[in-house]
Interface confidence: low
């Protein structure tokens, strides 16, 4: 279970990083990036990797460049492996990254945060029962 807990900690850290980057959204290159939304069950890990692969970049405007680049680098770090992550269901062909709607950085980050929250929720609900509205 330790791997799972490490994984949850990492997911929460990623949410913090996304929130931090949202504060600097005007300092990001206003490029449209594939932003998965309403991700199909068991294609979540595929969508997660699409967010990580996206070319989110600092616009190199002033003092915030270093903190933005550090945050983007942290976003791209692989999370600790879990059974569920390793074993993305091979019976489904998940949409390619390019097939997802492209959005500017603000919406991209909002959708990434939404997926991370869903990821945490699903992992927790795989371990406990009871009300799951959150």
């Amino acid at each position: 279970m330790q791997g799972q807990d490490r994984h949850m900690i990492r997911m929460r850290q990623l949410i913090d990083i996304v929130d931090q980057l949202k504060n600097y959204v005007n300092d990001l290159v206003p490029e449209f990036l594939p932003a998965p939304e309403d991700v199909e069950t068991n294609c979540e890990w595929s969508a997660f990797s699409c967010f990580q692969k996206a070319q989110l970049k600092s616009a190199n405007t002033g003092n915030n460049e270093r903190i933005i680049n550090v945050s983007i680098k942290k976003l791209k770090r692989k999370p600790p492996s879990t059974n569920a992550g390793r074993r993305q269901k091979h019976r489904l062909t998940c949409p390619s990254c390019d097939s997802y709607e492209k959005k500017p950085p603000k919406e991209f980050l909002e959708r990434f945060k939404s997926l991370l929250q869903k990821m945490i929720h699903q992992h927790l609900s795989s371990r406990t029962h009871g009300s799951e509205d959150s």
Epitope: E40, T41, R91, P95, S126
Partner: antibody, heavy 120, light 107 residues
Framework: EVQLVESGGGLVKPGGSLRLSCAAS????????MNWVRQAPGKGLEWVSS????????HYADSVKGRFTISRDNAKNSLYLQMNSLRAEDTAVYYC?????????????WGQGTTVTVSS | AIQLTQSPSSLSASVGDRVTITCRAS??????LAWYQQKPGKAPKILIH???SLESGVPSRFSGSGSGTDFTLTISSLQPEDFATYYC?????????FGQGTKLEIK
């Protein structure tokens, strides 16, 4: 409380139609794949159909392909099974079932079942 | 379709006994298997997911093992409430399939 409640079962003549509904509550319905599983009287469990969270992937057992249609309305937290050209062998208790996501294998929440009887 | 064969089909045992039910898949299904318990007139209840992960709230006397084609459900010390029918189910590929069931009866 996590709950699935089926409705719509009943007695129908061979060749007839029926629409089963399943109302979900207590969890984020739009995040999960859903299934219909049936059990004929005195028999084992038989998987009938599956639909993923956004209806992108739909699958059916060979025994119902072309006759049954699964659908869902995430805004209404509801799952449906439209059953046409019903046969005597479709007589069973039909369960609405939640399937885990994220690569976990198992159906963790089951409804109480609704009975479908096909008889002349 | 992947076939699951459970053995035995029925089993008589006493309270306190250790019981093992096996499920054999016609193809390699990795660990994409779950075990369920069903009592008469009730919906099935999940016991084990991912072949060996105990479901939350299920007593620790239940355990699952196996990977590939051979899987086992073990009840270490039977309790009166464990007399029921047990099913395995594979999730490796569609159509999903269940084993035919194992009925566990009181000796």
């Amino acid at each position: 409380e996590v709950q699935l409640v089926e409705s719509g079962g009943g007695l129908v003549k061979p060749g007839g139609s029926l629409r089963l509904s399943c109302a979900a509550s207590g969890f984020i319905f739009s995040s999960y794949s859903m299934n219909w599983v049936r059990q004929a009287p005195g028999k084992g469990l038989e998987w009938v159909s599956s639909i993923t969270s956004g209806s992108y992937y739909i699958h059916y057992a060979d025994s119902v392909k072309g006759r049954f249609t699964i659908s869902r309305d995430n805004a209404k937290n509801s799952l449906y099974l439209q059953m046409n050209s019903l046969r005597a062998e479709d007589t069973a208790v039909y369960y609405c079932v939640r399937e885990r996501g994220w690569g976990y294998y198992g159906m963790d929440v089951w409804g109480q079942g609704t009975t479908v009887t096909v008889s002349s | 379709a992947i076939q699951l064969t459970q053995s035995p089909s029925s089993l008589s045992a006493s309270v306190g006994d250790r019981v093992t039910i096996t499920c054999r898949a016609s193809n390699d299904i990795d660990s994409a298997l779950a075990w369920y318990q069903q009592k008469p007139g009730k919906a099935p209840k999940i016991l084990i997911h991912d072949a060996s992960s105990l479901e939350s709230g299920v007593p620790s006397r239940f355990s699952g093992s196996g990977s590939g084609t051979d899987f086992t459900l073990t009840i270490s010390s039977l309790q009166p409430e464990d007399f029921a029918t047990y099913y395995c189910q594979q999730f490796n590929s569609y159509p999903y399939t269940f084993g035919q069931g194992t009925k566990l009866e009181i000796k």
